[in-house]
Amino acid sequence: VPRWRQQWSGPGTTKRFPETVLARCVKYTEIHPEMRHVDCQSVWDAFKGAFISKHPCNITEEDYQPLMKLGTQTVPCNKILLWSRIKDLAHQFTQVQRDMFTLEDTLLGYLADDLTWCGEFNTSKINYQSCPDWRKDCSNNPVSVFWKTVSRRFAEAACDVVHVMLNGSRSKIFDKNSTFGSVEVHNLQPEKVQTLEAWVIHGGREDSRDLCQDPTIKELESIISKRNIQFSCKNIYRPDKFLQCVKNPEDSSCTSEI
């Protein structure tokens, strides 16, 4: 008799999930020699332990603590780049500006980037058919709780000037419901963080508006100021030129506004 299986609204666990996590861990330690003390088998066991045999709507930050401990990593606290709805450009930037870090440049972020996973209550099986959707099913699912946990820790670690890249093409440039808006903003430590500098990335070629005046940016400024952190904002009118100038700052065309 086929066992009844909960059907969730979201996509199932990414295929080859265990192999991918393990391979990513090994790759990360190969290219980041300072993390070679990490035992990737233990990392996978801790990752698995956070969600296997647990109801996928009943996951807590506590479930991820063993993994958090194994993945403890020191990044320069004044070199943190947060992002919201513009991941690819943020990653292209840290790929060029090697001394800055997004969450996905850390071991735990690198392990889980773009993956989906969940288990089932009381069985050791991984559910490859479906996983809970944050909106339609539940917010305390394995993926959402993981990102909430690592994002909180990443924001808590930040100091001095923290940068955030925001997507100027979206209707809500700053979205209170994004991970940045709901987790990271509220976990920046005012005693350590002096300024949050937003970079608003323009999408259109001819878009010369000052998106730093957008109502949602003003809302972000208000939230940040209330937390005793200074706020500044820059328009990045030409993201392609911006990246090019990060690569080649001495280029003569890089003195003008980008």
Epitope: E19, C25, K27, P33, R36, H37, Q41, D113
Partner: antibody, heavy 123, light 112 residues
Framework: QMQLVQSGAEVKKTGSSVKVSCKAS????????MHWVRQAPGQALEWMGW????????DYAQKFQDRVTITADRSMSTAYMELSSLRSEDTAMYYC????????????????WGQGTLVTVSS | DIVMTQSPLSLPVTPGEPASISCQSS???????????LNWYLQKPGQSPQLLIY???TRAAGVPDRFSGSGSGTDFTLKISRVEAEDVGVYYC?????????FGQGTKLEIK
């Protein structure tokens, strides 16, 4: 079995570019970092850079930073190394290479190598 | 960058006799994980390099037990207990403790 097969020998003019390919088979291409190493005639081995084929992220030796571009085509399980502004000193054998994994740890040594691609730069 | 220095640069050996190659690094290659990131390769004439030893003393798959690696944080030795004709080629040490990985200048082993 695991194999890295590289493109054929190239003869290039000074100032031009060359693009060498390395086709991987016998393993999941995105699970391993791919490195590039070169060897000028009668000289020692020289590491040029790596690519993570899954993410496309790269890192290059300072010496080649401005002239080398390593890319990967996941659908073809192939890595590429392009070297621009060629000079006579770039005449060398170019290799792609990857580590082995020993019980979930990268061995730290290049256990698998392509057969090499000879690039000759002439004026 | 870490500098790797090999000696001798040329090593003529009689078959059946032992051989020893030295390698020095400008910094310790001992990682906090307890492993020493020193590798040895053999490049036979006309071939790609092949990994012989990794982590200073661990033989790679399929490497005969006549090859052994030893050393401390900065001084390393590759020993061949009894040289065979097929062992001719250039031997390279390499550090992989940090980027960029760097190689020694090579030791050419030839049969007397």
């Amino acid at each position: 079995q695991m194999q890295l097969v590289q493109s054929g020998a190239e003869v290039k003019k000074t100032g031009s570019s060359v693009k060498v390919s390395c086709k991987a088979s016998g393993y999941t291409f995105t699970d391993y970092i791919m490195h590039w190493v070169r060897q000028a005639p009668g000289q020692a081995l020289e590491w040029m850079g790596w690519i993570d084929p899954e993410y496309g992220s790269t890192d290059y030796a300072q010496k080649f930073q401005d002239r080398v571009t390593i890319t990967a085509d996941r659908s073809m399980s192939t890595a590429y190394m392009e070297l621009s502004s060629l000079r006579s000193e770039d005449t060398a054998m170019y290799y792609c290479a990857r580590v082995a994994i020993i019980t979930t740890v990268a061995s730290g040594g290049f256990a698998y190598w392509g057969q090499g691609t000879l690039v000759t730069v002439s004026s | 960058d870490i500098v790797m220095t090999q000696s001798p640069l040329s090593l003529p050996v009689t078959p059946g006799e032992p051989a020893s190659i030295s390698c020095q690094s400008s910094e310790s290659l001992l990682h906090s994980n307890g492993k020493t990131y020193l590798n040895w390769y053999l490049q036979k004439p006309g071939q790609s390099p092949q990994l012989l030893i990794y982590w200073m003393s661990t033989r790679a798959a399929g490497v005969p037990d006549r090859f052994s690696g030893s050393g401390s944080g900065t001084d390393f030795t590759l020993k061949i207990s009894r040289v065979e004709a097929e062992d001719v080629g250039v031997y390279y040490c390499q550090q992989f403790l940090e980027y960029p990985p760097t190689f020694g200048q090579g030791t050419k082993l030839e049969i007397k």
